[in-house]
């Protein structure tokens, strides 16, 4: 699986999850998030050669098409597969609010 | 929606579905498919600026991050959203077989 366990440990050029830390204030301008200050959002990148973690029949077809027609611009793209939520603390006035934001952390990738 | 209705009618630079005809024999080397000879598989391409048809909170966050940090390599990617099946005819010996291959045709795209 193209997940953090595999990808963060290996120098993988093809589609894999990459570590990316995002600071809410500095990187997003979100000053309203009190805790955490930032988090590992991660991202997916890298080429999608034929059959690499293909998401659908279409991505398999497109991967093969791209292999046989390397000059073509059509190819599958490396995108998030499994995502996890992130719990944040923010304030409404002086009242603390805890909320779980869904699909915030990429845990694995696929070729789509 | 970034679907064929919109994308095929407009000169859209950002993420959109693009027409792509695939000939089974010539483009894939699949000589076993008898009918059709080929089909419009289509594909997704184009930049994913902030908030453009964002698939998840993560893609929204990544889009904003990329806007504020344009030198960063992390950005959402334009990939298939809705796919449709394709019915094909092939032969096993002299026996014709009709089969529906799922997720073969891209109808719309999203930024993931």
């Amino acid at each position: 699986a193209l997940d953090t366990n595999y990808c963060f440990r290996n120098l993988e050029e093809n589609c894999c999850v990459r570590p990316l830390y995002i600071d809410f204030r500095q990187d997003l301008g979100w000053k309203w998030v009190h805790e955490p200050k930032g988090y590992y959002a991660n991202f997916c990148s890298g080429p999608c050669p034929y059959l690499r973690s293909a998401d659908t029949t279409h991505s398999t077809v497109l991967g093969l098409y791209n292999t046989l027609n390397p000059e073509a611009s059509a190819s599958p793209c490396c995108v998030p597969q499994d995502l996890e939520p992130l719990t944040i603390l923010y304030y409404v006035g002086r009242t603390p609010k805890v909320e779980q934001l869904s699909n915030m952390v990429v845990k694995s990738c696929k070729c789509s | 929606a970034l679907d064929t209705n919109y994308c095929f009618r407009n000169l859209e630079e950002n993420c959109c579905v693009r027409p792509l005809y695939i000939d089974f024999r010539q483009d894939l080397g699949w000589k076993w498919v008898h009918e059709p000879k080929g089909y419009y598989a289509n594909f997704c391409s184009g930049p994913c600026p902030y908030l453009r048809s964002a698939d998840t909170t993560h893609s929204t966050v990544l889009g904003l991050y990329n806007t504020l940090n344009p030198e960063a390599s992390a950005s959402p990617c334009c990939v298939p959203q809705d796919l449709e099946p394709l019915t094909i005819l092939y032969y096993v010996g002299r026996t014709p077989k009709v089969e529906q291959l799922s997720n073969m045709v891209v109808k719309s795209c999203k930024c993931s």
Epitope: Y21, R25, Q26, D27, G29, K37 | N69
Partner: antibody, heavy 120, light 107 residues
Framework: QVQLVQSGAEVKKPGSSVKVSCKAS????????IHWVKQRPGKGLEWIGR????????DYSEKFQGRVTITADKSTSTAYMELSSLRSEDTAVYYC?????????????WGQGTLVTVSS | DIQMTQSPSSLSASVGDRVTITCKAS??????VAWYQQKPGQSPKLLIY???NRYTGVPDRFSGSGYGTDFTFTISSLQAEDVAVYYC?????????FGGGTKVEIK
Amino acid sequence: QVQLVQSGAEVKKPGSSVKVSCKASGYTFSSSWIHWVKQRPGKGLEWIGRIYPGDGDTDYSEKFQGRVTITADKSTSTAYMELSSLRSEDTAVYYCARRMITTQAALDYWGQGTLVTVSS
Amino acid sequence: DIQMTQSPSSLSASVGDRVTITCKASQSVINAVAWYQQKPGQSPKLLIYYASNRYTGVPDRFSGSGYGTDFTFTISSLQAEDVAVYYCQQDYSSPYTFGGGTKVEIK
């Protein structure tokens, strides 16, 4: 180009306070964390704390909590680090540094350092 | 707090030698490690971030690797101008602790 210019050397008595300044230029001051780091003579680096000048949010090392106050003045693009109840072990060079863009807390630009000597 | 144990504390090598410094974190910091160079009388300079990414303008003889708790910093061919103290720093969680430093000298 990005520059962080710190105030000059200080000699202080034990029990007093010192306020070191760090003037930033060449980038948007309000949108990058400023960190403060301590280095005793001939010793290693020790992280003190940081401030986000955009809204004044701070984060301190527990070791310095209660004795250190980090502030920022957006109008002059200057960050300050004030250390109170000074003792001899506070004799050190104090650096301000900017958190680089697109990574966690790596520090890409540093001030020249301010030597604070605590002596009776 | 996360402890960063750096070794060796000092080393002496000849010009052209390969030099390796290690840093061990007391708990996993994923890949959130930076390496700095500090020459005598100067401020520290960032060399490596995210464990293996070379900072702008840093010569390619400097490299970093590692994940989790074990990290390595390498100078592939030591030059006279590389005489300095090198520090690792975990920037995974506050407080952002530094290793004790490694003094690199020329034989």
